[in-house]
Interface confidence: medium
């Protein structure tokens, strides 16, 4: 359905509040260094223009595409060249190349200060003084740090942020009410950002076929009672939504997401019995709820898969007639029977099945050739099962911090060329899989763990793509989306790596260490651990443990001293010398 004015269409569909919020997110995700006031000004100008188009769709420029309108507006920023350098060259291009150029310049690791949370009274005063500005600032600060954050979901986070302040700034103990809510929003927000980043990477690096395969598997697990045709329709619509959001088309994305939520709620009977409680909620909450909905119960009478996909003499005929549909049906049937498998495992099985059919359907006796195809799945299934079992045992034995350290050592030995901050960030997040997944019942462990690891490893891939330093990382990241995790798991100690020269400065600490939060102290220690491994990649676990224990004791001693700085100055060199001796 075509509209004379796309901007008027979206303004009317979304309403002013969501329209303004989404435009602010879009601009903040593109121009991540621009000051807040500049973005607010641009958003207000776009909004006023949209209102003129709503009043008269034939008015001047109202027929232009959203990319043209938004790109023109972004290109009016006076400091574009000096702030963004070559990104300013995008403005010399025509659409659609200009938008593609802006997308390519999105920075996953922008040089922005960490968001420091001031005292609760500061935040409550700012909230009461100007609620609208306060919430816009939240959208801006999150969007510029997370340039692929799922925009309609960010509006939902902002609504929760607003609700938290509205409730807690009235409370007797504001901090006790507010801080846990803000911690929860921060942690959920980071997780949401990382999950969306994987969806965008999947679409952008591996194409919509890869994303659709992921969606078929995941939706079939969630909605095992739905027919294949119903799942296919949802997959097509969901792919459109995420393609739009990942492409910076945030108004279209939010609009289509709302349409998808409406469709699902109108067709609950043919999708899932679990949708009912979501469908009674307001739009943003409803869409979030539908995205997070638990798996429906599997139908009791599902027949064996072997009949249609192994025993049937028509397998090659059906495959040849419509390869993607046949493989899609296989994936749907397998996934709806296996909520206990990770999506990535299901996709590996579908890939293995496809490879077998490609080979066997060209053979003299195809049926004889593919008769044992399901037996070939066994090692593929056992590999993640064993991995989860071993790592959960290690997590339970060590606890989260020491489990993270074990992963830090493991990954630094695999890819020592990767920057220390990236290794620390990624390994800390890999280590969080323990607390997140190991407490779950057996049937939920693998999907939780492996699909979470895929999200974390995608962060490594995204950061590494910006500054590539390791052929191994490039290989694991680019060869196969579904085999990324097994590829990283299979990496061994990099024998070709030349150990980093010892730098005493790296292991020099000061009294400011004592005022750090527990998390910041851990990061400092883990940074030192990575540097140690880079210096001595063949150090044993025992050697590294000895050094880290000495480090903890040294820091504890100096933080208890009367003259902390003097203690660090005196004890530091002793610690460095002892560490070098222990690792010699």
């Amino acid at each position: 359905d075509t509209h004379k004015s796309e901007v008027a269409h979206r303004f009317k569909d979304l309403g002013e509040e969501h329209f303004k919020g989404l435009v602010l997110v879009a601009f903040s995700q593109y121009l991540q260094q621009c000051p807040f006031e500049e973005h607010v000004k641009l958003v207000n100008e776009v909004t006023e223009f949209a209102k003129t188009c709503v009043a008269d769709e034939s008015a001047e420029n109202c027929d232009k595409s959203l990319h043209t309108l938004f790109g023109d507006k972004l290109c009016t920023v006076a400091t574009l060249r000096e702030t963004y350098g070559e990104m300013a060259d995008c403005c010399a291009k025509q659409e659609p190349e200009r938008n593609e150029c802006f997308l390519q310049h999105k920075d996953d690791n922008p040089n922005l200060p960490p968001l420091v949370r001031p005292e609760v009274d500061v935040m409550c005063t700012a909230f009461h003084d100007n609620e609208a500005t306060f919430l816009k600032k939240y959208l801006y600060e999150v969007a510029r740090r997370h340039p692929y954050f799922y925009a309609p979901e960010l509006l939902f986070f902002a609504a929760r942020y607003k609700a938290a302040f509205a409730e807690c700034c009235q409370a007797a103990d504001k901090a006790a009410c507010l801080l846990p809510k803000l911690d929860e929003l921060r942690d959920e927000g980071k997780a949401s950002s990382a999950k969306q980043r994987l969806k965008c990477a999947s679409l952008q690096k591996f194409g919509d076929r890869a994303f659709k395969a992921w969606a078929v598997a995941r939706l079939s697990q969630k909605f095992p009672k739905a027919e294949f045709a119903e799942v296919s329709k949802l997959v097509t619509d969901l792919t459109k939504v995420h393609t739009e959001c990942c492409h910076g088309d945030l108004l279209e994305c939010a609009d289509d997401r709302a349409d998808l939520a409406k469709y699902m709620c109108e067709n609950q009977d043919s999708i899932s019995s679990k949708l009912k409680e979501c469908c009674d909620k307001p739009l943003l909450e409803k869409s979030h709820c539908l995205a997070e909905v638990e798996n429906d119960e599997m139908p009791a009478d599902l027949p064996s898969l072997a009949a249609d996909y192994v025993e049937s003499k028509d397998v090659c005929k059906n495959y040849a007639e419509a390869k993607d549909v046949f493989l899609g049906m296989f994936l749907y049937e397998y996934a709806r029977r296996h909520p206990d498998y990770s999506v990535m495992l299901l996709l590996r099985l579908a890939k293995a099945y496809e490879a077998t059919l490609e080979k066997c359907c060209a053979a003299a006796d195809p049926h004889e050739c593919y008769a044992k195809v399901f037996d070939e799945f066994q090692p593929l299934v056992e590999e993640p099962q064993n991995l989860v079992k071993q790592n959960c045992e290690l997590f339970e034995q060590l606890g989260e911090y020491k489990f993270q350290n074990a992963l830090l050592v493991r990954y630094t030995k695999k890819v020592p060329q990767v920057s220390t901050p990236t290794l620390v960030e990624v390994s800390r997040n890999l280590g969080k899989v323990g607390a997140k997944c190991c407490k779950l019942p057996e049937a939920k462990r693998m999907p939780c763990a492996e699909d979470y690891l895929s999200v974390v490893l995608n962060r490594l891939c995204v950061l590494h793509e910006k500054t590539p330093v390791s052929e191994k990382v490039t290989k694991c990241c680019t060869e196969s989306l579904v085999n990324r995790r097994p590829c990283f798991s299979a990496l061994e100690l990099d024998e070709a790596y030349v150990p980093k020269a010892f730098n005493a400065e790296t292991f020099t600490f000061h009294a400011d260490m004592c005022t750090l939060s527990e998390k910041e102290k851990q990061v400092k220690k883990q940074t030192a651990l990575v540097e140690l491994v880079k210096h001595k990649p063949k150090a044993t676990k025992e050697q590294l443990k000895g050094v880290m224990d000495n480090f903890a004791a040294f820091v504890e001693k100096c933080c208890k001293a009367d003259d902390k700085e003097a203690c660090f100055a005196e004890e530091g060199p002793k610690f460095v010398a002892a560490s070098q001796a222990a690792l010699a």
């Epitope: 005292e119 600032k137 005022t515």
Partner: nanobody, 115 residues
């Protein structure tokens, strides 16, 4: 409305000193930061002081500028020594520390350094 009032700016020769003050209406806020905006440039962080008194400075002012505060007077200061021509800008303060501002900007105070 919280109001932030900056003062202490002026014209000075290279190598000179100024002390800027910023008063926050109502109460003492933490953390606080000084920012500046030169003509045709974006506003940038200059110095910040945390809840615990820890400080942070832009590389270009390290060793020359000192941020401090007087909790009793709800005031934060920026002592600027060895001023250079590139320090010429309008200086603003805000609540929120390094790179983050929580309240509407005040009018700022102009600092001009030239011979």
């Amino acid at each position: 409305q919280v109001q932030l009032v900056e003062s202490g700016g002026g014209s000075v020769q290279p190598g000179g000193s100024l002390r800027l003050s910023c008063a926050a209406s109502g109460r003492n806020f933490n953390p606080m930061g000084w920012f500046r905006q030169a003509p045709g440039k974006q506003r940038e962080s200059v110095a910040a002081i945390g809840t615990d008194g820890s400080t942070k400075y832009a590389d270009s002012v390290k060793g020359r500028f000192t941020i401090s505060r007087d909790n009793g007077k709800n005031t934060v200061y920026l002592q600027m020594n060895s001023l250079k021509s590139e320090d010429t800008a309008v200086y603003y303060c805000n609540v929120g520390g390094w790179g983050i501002s929580w309240f509407p900007w005040g009018r700022g105070t102009q600092v001009s350094v030239s011979s």
